[in-house]
């Protein structure tokens, strides 16, 4: 099959602190050395970019400094945070990989991690 | 709104150069895969060339590699296809396309025309 | 390399009828990765279908995809005047990209 598959959580909770972590486990079909992990929200037909990280295999992911994301890899599989989180936010979050080098290309998308996010209530005034 | 024009086309005789370009607008330009699309005259359609986000990756057809660079300019939000050596059979509408973020190709320019002919 | 084979060729059909499009692919392609474009005489293609089954923003309802591994089909419920053009398909999970040959569907 000329298609790459990756797996993800169907369903994640936030933290009260606004912090959601998931797995995203590709099945690669060659030996990619470069490897650029998405990840993406999908609000009825739009999608936007969350964040994105490119990697050499065996090496950190480094996203963007003001980026609300951090990941860790371990072969075929990426371990991603998403930070800064608020109700508005819950959504279909989807894990995008790409084999990019060496040829051939490979896309793999995720069937998407739906990210419930519950902001905390704020805490009552004291009397003492 | 977003948008692709495509710029460069002419006629040219074989063995000869051209350069076409595609300027985008309307999007970040540097989050999107960009690719080049041909159609020979009365033809269907026919995947040219992709560069990927900071340029570093790219991929060509085989009826082009070695013949055709393509390339981009984040900075300009532009994107290029430089045409060496051309052949008859490279004639047709070049088209620029963007690849969305789940892959397929959701924007396209309107198309510019190269003709080989001696 | 897949190779994406469409049939028919030509489609002839009146306006209100319903319009079948296949395609076949060379060998299995993931359903995420599969793709239906529209061209009209003079103009670019234009996204329909992508991921096998989602339509393209501002694409009407009347136009559907469906399949999976390596047979693919677009439906068009009932046609409209618009609506006939060459349709293609395309598979985009792996490089290289490559289209069908295209069915063309003209006016009865």
């Known amino acids: 099959c000329k298609a790459m598959h990756v797996a993800q959580p169907a369903v994640v909770l936030a933290s009260s602190r606004g912090i959601a972590s998931f797995v995203c486990e590709y099945a690669s079909p060659g030996k990619a050395t470069e490897v650029r992990v998405t990840v993406l929200r999908q609000a009825d037909s739009q999608v936007t970019e969350v964040c994105a990280a490119t990697y050499m295999m065996g090496n950190e992911l480094t996203f963007l400094d003001d980026s609300i994301c951090t990941g860790t890899s371990s072969g075929n599989q990426v371990n991603l945070t998403i930070q800064g989180l608020r109700a508005m936010d819950t959504g279909l979050y989807i894990c995008k990989v790409e084999l990019m080098y060496p040829p051939p290309y490979y896309l793999g998308i995720g069937n998407g991690t739906q990210i419930y996010v519950i902001d905390p209530e704020p805490c009552p005034d004291s009397d003492f | 709104q977003v948008q692709l024009v495509e710029s460069g086309g002419g006629v040219v005789q074989p063995g000869r150069s051209l350069r076409l370009s595609c300027a985008a607008s309307?999007?970040?330009?540097?989050?999107?895969?960009m690719h080049w699309v041909r159609q020979a005259p009365g033809k269907g359609l026919e995947w040219v060339a992709v560069?990927?986000?900071?340029?570093?990756?790219?991929y060509y057809a085989d009826s082009v590699k070695g013949r055709f660079t393509i390339s981009r300019d984040n900075s300009k939000n532009t994107l290029y296809l430089q045409m060496n050596s051309l052949r008859a059979e490279d004639t047709a509408v070049y088209y620029c396309?963007?690849?969305?973020?789940?892959?397929?190709?959701?924007?396209w320019g309107q198309g510019t025309m190269v003709t080989v002919s001696s | 390399e897949i190779v994406l084979t469409q049939s028919p060729g030509t489609l002839s059909l009146s306006p209100g009828e319903r319009a079948t499009l296949s395609c076949g692919a060379s060998?299995?392609?993931?359903?995420?990765?599969f793709a239906w474009y529209q061209q009209k005489p003079g103009q670019a293609p234009r996204l329909l279908i992508y991921?096998?089954?989602s339509r393209a923003t501002g694409i009407p309802d009347r136009f559907s995809g469906s399949g999976s591994g390596t047979d693919f089909t677009l439906t068009i419920s009932r046609l409209e005047t618009e609506d006939f053009a060459v349709f293609y398909c395309?598979?985009?999970?792996?490089?290289?990209?490559?289209f069908g040959q295209g069915t063309k569907v003209e006016i009865k």
């Open positions: 396309a963007r690849a969305g973020h789940l892959g397929a190709f959701d924007i």
């Open positions: 309307g999007f970040t330009f540097s989050r999107y895969g």
């Open positions: 560069i990927w986000y900071d340029g570093s990756n790219k």
């Open positions: 060998q299995s392609v993931g359903s995420n990765y």
């Open positions: 991921g096998a089954s």
């Open positions: 395309q598979h985009y999970g792996s490089s290289p990209w490559t």
